[in-house]
């Protein structure tokens, strides 16, 4: 699998979506996990409604989002007020069983607000009274890693 | 108006099968699923499980896997909800009702309208 | 399953009392919680979807607020009509779970 890289500004939301074969992936629930280390496990995040045919609905987990059109075939994924420590790899599943299958390898790369002219240990976190309604949802920017690209920095 | 008509009231032995329906009108039956809710007598109410009129998918609660089927009939616009091997606990009123059908990133999903209930009773 | 648990089970009040009734989830339900009314020998009726938004045509002595785990169906000023078993309902996790209801009965 290539990894797409989506890049998103600290503070905003951003979108990633998953493109696939609906007819192949038809009646499986999707998942978004992170990869920990290159040749680590990819640990949960979130996951599609447990009911297939409920797959639309958008389930949380913190604050990242999750919601799977099952027609269409794109899974998208939504990190809400996006912080550094979100930047990473991450794979959208497809789920039969026990098992998982990569629909794609993304790595999210957060972009210092430019609008933010504090220092960048001093970033804004919304207040809990702050709906998701009301924030501004970026588009994100997304491109193929290059042949040779590495997406973990190397360990020492 | 928006509606939803159950068949009547069925009496069934131990060991059988019941089948109730549900025709539904003032609305596009495909655009919504049906699902089937039950109480019994003095109790509380027990989701069974739902089904996509546009397709005919069905997904069921684990405690009625094996023992119900729905199905349902475009031509009608009318959804089936058939259990098996009834036992004296199976008597309740069966309730279809109708929830928001495949849409896009939506953040609730509720039941909004109701059939009016079909009481079966399981006695020997 | 993710279990549903109300209280009071049963309440008395009076007619222009505001009730309040409660509705735990065994894990979280982000806000994919229902209120239903029951009426003896009637269908539920909804109320209150997606933990706080009233449905259409319902009176707004009803409200409902909460996420996660916790949450409250209020009746501002109880009238005659209200009398009734309401029931939480959450719709987060396969199988749907409703809560045992709780009966508001007139004093």
């Known amino acids: 699998h290539n990894t797409t890289v989506f890049q998103g500004v600290a503070g905003q939301s951003l979108q990633v979506s998953c493109p696939y074969d609906s007819m192949k992936h038809w009646g499986r629930r999707k998942a978004w996990c992170r990869q920990l280390g290159e040749k680590g496990p990819c640990q949960r995040v979130v996951s599609t409604h447990n009911l297939w045919l409920l797959s639309f609905l958008r389930r949380w987990n913190g604050s990242t989002a999750i919601t799977d059109d099952t027609l269409g075939g794109t899974l998208t994924i939504t990190l809400r007020n996006l912080q550094p420590h979100d930047a990473g790899l991450y794979q959208c599943q497809s789920l039969h069983g026990s098992e998982a299958d990569t629909l794609r390898k993304v790595l999210v790369e957060v972009l210092a607000d430019p609008l933010d002219h504090r220092d960048a240990g001093d970033l804004w976190f919304p207040g809990e009274s702050e709906s998701f309604e009301d924030a501004h949802v970026e588009h994100s920017i997304s491109r193929s890693l290059l042949e040779g690209e590495i997406p973990f920095p190397p360990t020492s | 108006q928006v509606q939803l008509v159950q068949s009547g009231a069925e009496v069934k032995k131990p060991g059988a099968s019941v089948k109730v329906s549900c025709k539904a009108s003032g609305y596009t039956f495909t655009s919504y699923y049906m699902h089937w809710v039950r109480q019994a007598p003095g109790q509380g109410l027990e989701w069974m499980g739902i089904i996509n009129p546009s397709g005919g998918s069905t997904s069921y609660a684990q405690k009625f896997q094996g023992r119900v089927t729905m199905t349902r009939d475009t031509s009608t616009s009318t959804v089936y909800m058939e259990l098996s091997s009834l036992r004296s606990e199976d008597t309740a009123v069966y309730y279809c009702?109708?929830?928001?059908?495949?849409?896009?990133?939506?953040?609730?999903?509720?039941?909004?309208?109701w059939g009016k209930g079909t009481t079966v009773t399981v006695s020997s | 399953d993710i279990q549903m648990t109300q209280s009071p089970s049963s309440l008395s009040a009076s007619v222009g009392d505001r009730v309040t009734i409660t509705c735990r989830a065994s894990q979280s339900i982000n806000s994919y919680l229902n209120w239903y009314q029951q009426k003896p020998g009637k269908a539920p009726k909804l109320l209150i979807y997606?933990?706080?938004s009233l449905q259409s045509g319902v009176p707004s002595r009803f409200s409902g607020s909460g996420s996660g785990t916790d949450f409250t169906l209020t009746i501002s000023s109880l009238q005659p009509e209200d009398f009734a078993t309401y029931y939480c309902q959450q719709s987060d996790d396969d199988p749907f779970t409703f809560g045992g209801g709780t009966k508001v009965e007139i004093k």
């Open positions: 009702a109708r929830g928001p059908g495949y849409t896009t990133a939506l953040d609730y999903y509720y039941m909004d309208v």
């Open positions: 997606a933990a706080s």
